[in-house]
């Protein structure tokens, strides 16, 4: 009984199409597959950023795979051929591993790369990123930001830079069509006559860095002798009502402070007839149904009632 063997895939490589971290892993079928013409060969692919403890594992019949990586670090990948048990009259047969690596040769010392990169997607409409220049870089150093997400033909440079002392320290992005719920890749590189500048790579999803506008049109309504309903409207803009959480701060007679988090645009407050003053503010955040993370809005303008019997009227700002 001869032992069945299969070769690893050929020409295994990691290809960088210039998408700032979204890479192609590709390979060719193994040599000497003639014996297995009736068989569908599969490939087990493992890959990770160098330094990561865990491998991502994919089993595929294709000759390519695409995924996002952190280009601040190197990438390693390995692949082997799998012959299913149907092809071998018994157990699955695996080839040896073919391995490859990829990294961008770093230019410049780490301190020259941008510091404190911060990106906020204001009201799910306007993306603004800002950074500080690298430590010890001279004023002739300038930074350029490039971005890419699936749907763009190629990486694009920032349209509107924010400057300080002639240096680019931020970017206001143009309209980003169909850019949420997918990885958004950024590279900030730099140039200087004096020394090479280290590039920085960032990846995030836009819906997770949204800072909404604050709620508007805060009102009070007396529901009963001991209940007041606080109401407000969703912030203006494209974010649907179902995507909001709210935090309320209520102050009664300058003493009691009540805070609460709610999912819709009302909150019922128990009060006594002795309440002489009532103030509240609200802020908004994108909730877990629409994102994995988010940033609280600024607080709304304060809405106050004082001096009249709350039971007599609906109070509008």
């Amino acid at each position: 009984d001869t032992e069945i063997k299969v070769n690893p895939p050929q020409d295994f490589e990691i290809v960088d199409p210039g998408y700032l971290g979204y890479l192609y892993l590709q390979w060719q079928p193994p040599l000497s597959l003639d014996h297995f013409k009736e068989c569908t060969v599969e490939y087990e692919l493992k890959y990770r950023n160098i330094g990561s403890e865990t491998w991502k594992t994919i089993i595929t019949k294709n000759l390519h795979y695409k995924d996002g990586f952190d280009l601040n670090k190197g990438i390693e990948a390995k692949i082997h051929t799998l012959l299913p048990w149907q092809c071998t009259n018994g157990s699955e047969v695996q080839s040896s591993w073919a391995e490859t690596t990829y990294w961008i040769s770093p230019q410049g010392i780490p301190e020259t790369k941008v510091q404190d990169m911060d990106c906020v997607y204001y009201n799910w409409q306007y993306l603004l990123c800002s950074w500080k220049p690298g430590i010890g870089v001279l004023l002739d150093t300038n930074y350029n930001l490039f971005y890419w997400y699936e749907g763009l033909d190629h990486a694009l440079q920032c349209v509107d830079y924010i400057k300080a002392d002639g240096q680019n320290i931020g970017c206001r992005f143009p309209y980003l069509e169909a850019s949420d719920y997918k990885d958004f890749y950024i590279c900030v590189n730099g140039s200087s006559e004096n020394k090479p500048i280290r590039s920085s790579y960032f990846t995030f999803q836009l819906q997770n860095i949204v800072k909404p506008l604050p709620p508007v049109y805060l009102t009070f309504t007396r529901e009963s002798s001991c209940e007041i309903k606080l109401k407000w409207s969703i912030p203006l803009g494209p974010i649907p009502a179902r995507c909001f959480d709210y935090e309320i701060e209520i102050r009664e007679d300058d003493t009691t402070l009540v805070t609460a988090t709610v999912e819709n645009e009302t909150y019922t407050l128990k009060t006594t007839n002795e309440t002489r003053q009532l103030c509240f503010v609200v802020r908004s955040k994108v909730n877990i149904y629409c994102s994995d993370d988010g940033i609280w809005s600024e607080w709304s303008d304060k809405q106050c009632w004082e001096g009249e019997d709350l039971s007599k009227k609906t109070l509008l700002r």
């Epitope: 694009l156 349209v159 509107d160 931020g170």
Partner: antibody, heavy 119, light 111 residues
């Protein structure tokens, strides 16, 4: 609730200067560019310049030949436009107008300030 | 400076009919894969209102009957079904290069 509230109408003599203010509210002042646009009677709109309140960076329309100065006071969320060496053809309504970036146009405008230059 | 030329200067259209306004730039206003072309509506005694940015994107709160198209040097604003409240002057504007420049305006009236 975005609002841009401009200072009131002005009547000036030729050769004088005028300074128009624009108080912004309802948004984060430093996140948006502030443009100044004027409209003379029966004329097309004319862009005068813009300031980035975030960093104070300014672009001017060189057609105004150094007569225009745009400034901002971020603590007061207010932008200013000063036009010097006034002449009769500077009689116009002057608007401040907010825009996020060059690809977004100008989405909110002040109510306008009429400046009349007359001897 | 980039010169913006609008046509026609004035236009009379029946209620419910389509209105089309054209704008030509003296050079391309495309860059970074974006057309830096905006359209505004101005009613008497009021500041302009943003209708369309980046050639085809609707401004906030703009009715769906307003649409923009074009690239490079030639652009069009279309009102699919004219309403009485659409009577105004319409301006195109390029924001590719400083100084930003406006077209001369098109006065839209009801026939």
């Amino acid at each position: 609730q975005v609002q841009l509230v401009q200072s009131g109408a002005e009547v000036k003599k030729p050769g004088a200067s005028v300074k128009v203010s624009c108080k912004a509210s309802g948004y984060t002042f430093s996140n948006y560019l502030m443009n100044w646009v004027r409209q003379a009677p029966g004329q097309r709109l004319e862009w005068m310049g813009r300031i980035d309140p975030y960093d104070g960076d300014i672009d001017y329309n060189q057609n105004f030949k150094d007569r225009v100065t745009i400034t901002r006071d971020t603590s007061a969320s207010t932008a200013y436009m000063e036009l010097s060496s006034l002449r009769s053809e500077d009689t116009a309504v002057y608007y401040c107008a907010r825009g996020y970036g060059t690809a977004y146009g100008v989405d909110y405008w002040g109510q306008g300030t009429l400046v009349t230059v007359s001897s | 400076d980039i010169v913006m030329t609008q046509s026609p200067d004035s236009l009379a259209v029946s209620l419910g009919e389509r209105a089309t306004i054209n704008c030509r730039a003296s050079e391309s206003v495309d860059n970074y894969g974006i057309s830096f072309m905006n359209w505004y509506q101005q009613k008497p005694g009021q500041p302009p209102k943003l209708l369309i940015y980046a050639a085809s994107r609707q401004g906030s709160g703009v009715p769906d009957r307003f649409s923009g198209s074009g690239s490079g040097t030639d652009f069009t604003l279309t009102i699919s079904s004219l309403q009485a409240e659409d009577v105004a002057v319409y301006y195109c504007q390029q924001s590719k290069e400083v100084p930003w420049t406006f077209g001369g305006g098109t006065k839209l009236e009801i026939k």
